[in-house]
């Protein structure tokens, strides 16, 4: 079956500079502002649009060693970012795959909200339930905060 | 046990040049930034700059922009700050510090190179 | 940029007073604040990052609090080894002027 998940989680920073900087320019930000959750991404296959194959080692702070994605689509006008994790202990015995969509929009008040839909697939007849997807969840929500402290610091980049 | 140790005290005359470093250990050093403070005598703590080792990416606090070179070489788990001329205004305590992981508090802390600039 | 500024510079106090020392933000900084204690001659040290997480080993008497561009330092029943200066800082970024705690 397939099991959904949704997560909506505030910003300060503005749309684009937010898309630009976690989405198109994550791989190379999130390691350095968030170092015991991911140590590196670093591109098996592809160059960054879809297709690609991305092998992202957790750090430290992790139960989880690794997890490859592959990359869905990128929608710089729209701040929409698609992919999928294909492997990784991160899926266990339970889960074939999970497709990740992000979309930054404009929050009324100043600054924006990233949503994160989430399609867990299980294997078989296997149940998943919230708890078990919740993880996705908090890790989404500590790198977004990881990142918005850098540009709050360094507001001359990614604008 | 996370560990920074910096380089001994220095005496210079203004004009001079100085590199000063700050040694990391008992961590993955290239991973997490660092940062170097000034605190001059009897005053508060200012952040100069950080560096990332991992790629050598640094970043200067406005006011110290042209004023120090901060530099990194993870191959020896080394950060430095250097001077190409000593001024008077620069003898202070320079600390080096680790930004964790979590938000970036320099959770561990170099014990501070004194450096006196004087003719 | 941002500016930290801190408040009072300087208080005289007893052992076991409550001592409140806050810190503002130019704009807005989340809760993306930590507080340090110096004592003289030592280099800094992290008590609180993140606005109200304490760093590890850090006795619970110190506390923080605040977000957006309010924060408070409190220090529940000041100890001897309390008396030092402190400071908050904006991650990676500036420190406030700093706060003397002196002994009355």
């Known amino acids: 079956g397939v099991f959904n998940y949704e997560v909506e989680t505030p910003s300060v920073i503005p749309a684009a500079r937010l898309f630009k900087s976690y989405v198109l320019d994550g791989d190379k930000l999130i390691p350095k502002v968030a170092p015991q959750a991911i140590t590196s991404v670093e591109n098996v296959e592809g160059n960054g649009g879809p297709g690609t194959i991305k092998n992202i080692t957790f750090g430290e702070g992790s139960r989880y060693k690794y997890v490859k994605e592959r990359v869905d689509e990128v929608d710089n006008t729209n701040f929409t970012y698609s992919y999928t994790v294909i492997e990784g202990d991160v899926l266990g015995d339970k889960l074939e795959k999970v497709c990740h969509e992000l979309k930054i929009v404009a929050a009324p008040g100043g600054g924006s909200i990233l949503k994160i839909s989430s399609k867990f697939h299980a294997k078989g007849d296997h149940e998943i339930n919230a708890e078990e997807m919740k993880g996705a969840k908090e890790m989404a929500e500590k790198l977004l905060r990881a990142v918005e402290t850098y540009l709050l610091a360094h507001s001359a980049e990614y604008n | 046990e996370v560990q920074l140790v910096q380089s001994g005290a220095e005496v210079k005359k203004p004009g001079d040049s100085l590199k000063i470093s700050c040694k990391g250990s008992?961590?993955?050093?290239?991973?997490?930034?660092i940062g170097w403070v000034r605190q001059m005598p009897g005053k508060g703590l200012e952040l100069m700059g950080i560096?990332?080792?991992?790629?050598?990416?640094?970043k200067y606090r406005p006011s110290f922009l042209g004023q120090v070179t901060i530099s990194a070489d993870k191959s020896i788990a080394t950060a430095f700050l250097q001077w190409s001329r000593l001024t008077a205004s620069d003898t202070a305590i320079y600390y080096c510090?680790?930004?964790?992981?979590?938000?970036?508090?320099?959770?561990?802390w170099g014990q501070g190179t004194l450096v006196t600039v004087s003719s | 940029d941002i500016q930290m500024t801190q408040s009072p510079s300087s208080l005289s106090a007893s052992v076991g007073d409550r001592v409140t020392i806050t810190c503002r933000a130019s704009?807005?900084?989340?809760?993306?604040l930590n507080w340090y204690q110096q004592k003289p001659g030592k280099a800094p040290k992290l008590l609180i990052y993140?606005?109200?997480n304490l760093q590890s080993g850090v006795p619970s008497r110190f506390s923080g609090s605040g977000s957006g561009t309010d924060f408070t330092l409190t220090i529940s029943s000041l100890q001897p080894e309390d008396f030092a200066i402190y400071y908050c800082q904006q991650s990676y970024a500036a420190f406030g002027e700093g706060t003397k705690v002196e002994i009355k």
């Open positions: 008992g961590y993955s050093f290239s991973n997490f930034w």
């Open positions: 510090a680790r930004l964790g992981a979590t938000y970036a508090g320099a959770d561990f």
């Open positions: 560096v990332y080792p991992g790629d050598s990416d640094t």
């Open positions: 993140a606005a109200s």
């Open positions: 704009q807005t900084i989340v809760t993306y």
